[in-house]
């Protein structure tokens, strides 16, 4: 039994880091493998993560963490029974994938303005809470070419756009994702999408 692709991990900078790897053949990850991990400075016995299958030869493990600070470094040991298959380390602050924003809502009752709001996925005491910026994706269900991205570079989790920038009388969907420049993170997953029917009063033509 050998590791084909070494474990790579990403952290949500809050409570979970996810490690994925591939074995050289079909593997029952949960019965055959164990990923041991420990926060280096604690100098205590390692914790055990039981991996799950992620495709035939792929495995994934969700490491539970109480929190993260930038200096944290974890040791990782991948075991198959008594055999050490791989040894490595992981610094969560250098591999951050933020949590996806939630509760995306489109408010259509503001005069000819669409107000999109969503929730910051972090509690106020988490470092990322004040460092997230967002991308909002809006697309038409009827026209695949009608697809746009709005970059929200301020901290407030909201976006206002004129309803008239979208076509009237058709349905749109929106979703939002987050990233944090301070840790050069990857983008989060997209939030679940929300749907609304876009309608607005056409202005009277002046002759």
């Amino acid at each position: 039994m050998k590791v084909l692709q070494e474990p790579t991990c990403v952290s949500d900078y809050m409570s979970i880091s996810t490690c994925e790897w591939k074995m050289n053949g079909p593997t029952n990850c949960s019965t055959e493998l164990r990923l041991l991990y420990q926060l280096v400075f604690l100098l205590s016995e390692a914790h055990t993560c039981i991996p799950e299958n992620n495709g035939g030869a792929g495995c994934v493990c969700h490491l539970l963490m109480d929190d993260v600070v930038s200096a944290d470094n974890y040791t990782l040991d991948l075991w198959a029974g008594q055999q050490l298959l791989w040894k490595g380390s992981f610094k969560p602050s250098e591999h951050v994938k933020p949590r996806a924003p939630g509760n995306l809502t489109v408010h259509t009752n503001v005069s000819d303005t669409l107000l999109l709001t969503w929730s910051n996925p972090y509690p106020p005491d988490n470092y990322l809470y004040n460092h997230l910026t967002y991308a909002v994706n809006i697309w038409s269900e009827n026209d695949p070419a009608d697809f746009r991205i709005y970059n929200v570079t301020y901290l407030e989790p909201s976006l206002r756009i004129a309803a008239s920038t979208l076509k009237s009388g058709i349905s749109y969907r929106a979703r939002v994702r987050a990233w944090a420049q301070c840790y050069n993170t990857t983008w989060s997953e997209w939030s679940p999408s929300t749907k609304w029917h876009n309608s607005y009063r056409e202005p009277f033509e002046q002759h």
Partner: antibody, heavy 119, light 107 residues
């Protein structure tokens, strides 16, 4: 319940040696890092040394590096601090403390043993 | 090393008063902070760990708050038994560091 009992303190002359012990019970000693912390009379708390759960890693405060040695015997559930080349400024109450397996854990301390370095 | 700065260094208050002690870390330590009470000739007694978790058996008049670099220990209604010296401690590295202590005197 977790118990840590220090012993081995006493009066010793400058330049001499002393070995402190800390007997642990009520938890799986071999899973935890262990620390020594000291407090000079009328002063604050100062971290002295730490040893990893299996004894493979040891770290020291600059003030004791090269003079003090931390060790453990997991079969006896006992932590040690060997103190050589003692100085007057090493006079303090020495506490052993249990480390953490997670940063959300509870820290436990012993009641301390007094070391007096005096001629 | 992470430097912990406590204030005030001495505090005089009356029974029934609300008192607060502040601890500032030289860099972010998330919530990896403990508070201790120490009485003369005794070992430090853990009051609060993980910045805001009250140790079992500690009266509910004690509370801890804060994260990152700013932390507070509050006593909602001071009791005669609360005199002593209070210390904060960070544990986000293997070399623990402590605040210099706050001596609480009962008026």
């Amino acid at each position: 319940q977790v118990q840590l009992v220090e012993s081995g303190g006493g009066v010793v002359q400058p330049g001499r040696s002393l070995r402190l012990s800390c007997a642990a019970s009520g938890f799986t000693f071999s899973s935890y890092a262990m620390h020594w912390v000291r407090q000079a009379p009328g002063k604050g708390l100062e971290w002295v040394a730490v040893i990893s759960y299996d004894g493979s890693n040891k770290y020291y405060a600059d003030s004791v590096k090269g003079r003090f040695t931390i060790s453990r015997d997991n079969s006896k559930n006992t932590l040690y601090l060997q103190m050589n080349s003692l100085r007057a400024e090493d006079t303090a109450v020495y506490y052993c403390a249990r480390g953490l397996t997670t940063v959300r854990g509870v820290l436990y301390w012993g009641q301390g043993t007094l070391v007096t370095v005096s001629s | 090393d992470i430097v912990m700065t406590q204030s005030p260094s001495t505090l005089s208050a009356s029974v029934g008063d609300r008192v607060t002690i502040t601890c500032r870390a030289s860099q972010s330590i998330s919530t990896r902070l403990a508070w201790y009470q120490q009485k003369p000739g005794k070992a430090p007694k853990l009051l609060v760990y993980w910045a805001s978790s009250l140790e079992s058996g500690v009266p509910s008049r004690f509370s801890g708050s804060g994260s990152g670099t700013e932390f507070t220990l509050a006593i909602s209604s001071l009791q005669p038994d609360d005199f002593g010296t209070y210390y904060c401690q960070q544990y986000t590295s293997y070399s623990w560091t402590f605040g210099q202590g706050t001596k609480l005197e009962i008026k």
